[in-house]
């Protein structure tokens, strides 16, 4: 890709031009004393001869010039090669430095952006919560104001109608008084009579009100008596029920025996004849400690113990190490079964892990690992997986070999950063790795370009946050 051009400039110097990629280099070389241009006449310092030079003499000079030319050409070729070699090295060094510098800068910018984004997300969440609280408070205040306004309006309307009535009465009376001054005394008398009648009416109403108040007091007393009676009755019923259940279990030994049956996992529940989806009580291996788990008795032959489920964002998955250890959430909805139980269970016998995923476009996929177990808490519940099959990517989105589990208060990842704090949720983070099914739940149309969402890289890429996920385990020999 190099071009090399040779020409003469106006002064007579030789001009060499080297083209190297998009750069060109020009060298102006002065003539050597014994290498004068053949086009200009040769002037000797000797006294000019009368006769022309001998032929042999010319030939000899030409040979000298040719030798000099040959030397110059070789020298130029060496120069060209040297320049080209140097340029190659410099270009490679420049490119490498540029790539390294750019990569370093990009990583630094990326890390800064991630940190800033995480910080901004947290701040936005705080602001959003404050705005919601403020809005709720304002709404309540508005409601109270509108109620009090309605009351005032009603009172004003009542008073206005009352005023109107009084005004009518006053004008009528004024006319009467003006029209019949002679009947003034009689009118006064009739008014007095009306007043007396009104007073009688008022006193009657007062006595009626007093009677009603007495009746209300009596009714209240009766009501509290009834309530006490109802409470006593309920207590008696409960006591009777307890007595009945105690006597029944004492008579029927099969009831007590059935209560003693314990299941280690949903496969055992299924094999015992319970083939309906639902929440079942499981027992820790070699222990009496119990845990509630959801059993899927329909998918792929049933017997699946659900160890994780995300579906609507109703449960916060940014939890502590202890919470991920013992489990949290609601087995019928979003939940995490618990690392300690899963670790103990999967170290008793060989288990398979199936991860079922749903996106926001109605697609479904799964990843199935033919061997799955978690190390003990000593090794930070490290995940071990073998034999991947399924439709959610040919490469495992849980990094291999398995990583230790990390939470917001337990940084066991392979990053200088803290993946769990940055990406949210507890997970087997690498640095930080291609998956996180316990990330932030983002609703539809807000689920793209999210670095801290529910991620399964080898199915939907890095920025896509999934709609629903289920992690389930079952004995390999089921």
């Amino acid at each position: 890709y190099n071009n090399f051009r040779k020409s003469m400039d106006s002064i007579g110097k030789k001009q060499y031009q080297v083209q190297h990629g998009s750069c060109s280099y020009t060298f102006l070389l002065p003539e050597m004393d014994n290498c004068r241009s053949s086009s200009s006449p040769y002037v000797s310092n000797a006294v000019q001869r009368d006769a022309p030079l001998e032929y042999d003499d010319s030939v000899q000079r030409l040979q000298v010039l040719e030798n000099i030319m040959e030397n110059n050409t070789q020298w130029l070729m060496k120069l060209e090669n040297y320049i080209q070699d140097n340029m190659k090295k410099e270009m490679v060094e420049i490119q490498q430095n540029a790539v390294q510098n750019q990569t370093a800068v990009m990583i630094e910018i990326g890390t800064n952006l991630l940190n800033q984004t995480a910080e901004q997300t947290r701040k936005l969440t705080d602001v959003e919560a404050q705005v919601l609280n403020q809005t709720t408070r304002l709404e309540l205040q508005l409601l109270e104001h509108s109620l009090s306004t309605n009351k005032l309006e009603k009172q004003i309307l009542d008073q206005t109608s009352e005023i109107n009535k009084l005004q009518d009465k006053n004008s009528f009376l004024e006319k009467k008084v003006l029209a019949m001054e002679d009947k003034h005394i009689i009118q006064l008398q009739s008014i007095k009579e009306e007043k007396d009648q009104l007073q009688v009416l008022v006193s009657k109403q007062n006595s009626i009100i007093e009677e009603l108040e007495k009746k209300i007091v009596t009714a209240t007393v009766n009501n509290s008596v009834l309530q006490k009676q109802q409470h006593d009755l309920m207590e008696t019923v409960n006591n009777l029920l307890t007595m009945m259940s105690t006597s029944n279990s004492a008579k029927d030994p099969t009831v007590a025996k059935e209560e003693q049956i314990s299941f280690r996992d949903c496969a055992e529940v299924f094999k015992s004849g319970h083939t309906t989806n639902g929440i079942y009580t499981l027992t820790f291996p070699n222990s009496t400690e119990e845990i509630k788990a959801y059993c899927d008795m329909e998918a792929g032959g049933g017997g699946w113990t659900i160890i994780q489920r995300r579906e609507d964002g109703s449960v916060d998955f940014q939890r502590t190490w202890k919470e991920y250890k013992v489990g949290f959430g609601n087995p019928s909805g979003e939940y995490w079964l618990g690392n300690e139980f899963v670790s103990q269970l999967t170290n008793q016998q060989r288990y398979v892990l199936k991860i079922h995923l749903k996106d926001w476009e109605g697609n479904e996929a799964y990843s199935l690992y033919e061997h799955f177990y978690l190390s003990s808490e000593e090794l930070n519940y490290r995940i071990h997986l073998k034999g991947l099959t399924g439709t959610a990517g040919k490469i495992s989105s849980i990094s291999q070999p398995g990583n230790d589990f990390s939470t917001k208060d337990g940084d066991n990842d392979k990053c200088i950063c803290k993946c769990s704090q940055m990406l949210t949720g507890g997970w087997w983070f690498d640095a930080c790795g291609p998956s996180n099914l316990n990330g932030m739940y983002y609703p539809q149309r807000q689920n793209t370009n999210k670095f801290n969402g529910i991620k399964w890289y080898y199915w939907k890429g890095s920025g896509y946050s999934l709609k629903a996920t289920t992690m389930m385990i079952r004995p390999a020999d089921f």
């Epitope: 190490w321 090794l379 070999p401 066991n412 392979k414």
Partner: nanobody
Framework: QVQLVESGGGLVQPGGSLRLSCAAS????????MSWHRQTPGKERTMVAL????????TYADSVKGRFTISRDNAKNTVYLQMSNLKPEDTAVYYC?????????WGQGTQVTVSS
């Protein structure tokens, strides 16, 4: 119980090299992820390099990339930190670390001073 003992620190001139060692005992070393951290007075302890339990995958802080190398010898239950082209800002107490039961286990530390 978990025990980590660092060695190899000392005084070195800028541009010089040092090799730190961390001898581990009291736990299954081959299954442990190990890391080196450093701390200067009045500042937080920060991770410098990390080596995974399997495959020996490594991670480095940006400030030491290309100059420091972390390695392990599972037969000797030892993790190393090879430090070259040292700078005055590398002066610190260097600690060996492993995490078990979701908590940190540290060595006593070794002082590295880079000064002319």
């Amino acid at each position: 119980q978990v025990q980590l003992v660092e060695s190899g620190g000392g005084l070195v001139q800028p541009g010089g090299s040092l090799r730190l060692s961390c001898a581990a005992s009291g736990f299954s070393f081959s299954s442990a992820t190990m890391s080196w951290h450093r701390q200067t007075p009045g500042k937080e302890r920060t991770m410098v390099a990390l080596i995974a339990y399997a495959g020996g995958s490594t991670t480095y802080a940006d400030s030491v990339k290309g100059r420091f190398t972390i390695s392990r010898d599972n037969a000797k239950n030892t993790v190393y930190l090879q430090m070259s082209n040292l700078k005055p800002e590398d002066t610190a107490v260097y600690y060996c670390n492993t995490r078990r039961y979701n908590r940190d286990f540290w060595g006593q530390g070794t002082q590295v001073t880079v000064s002319s």
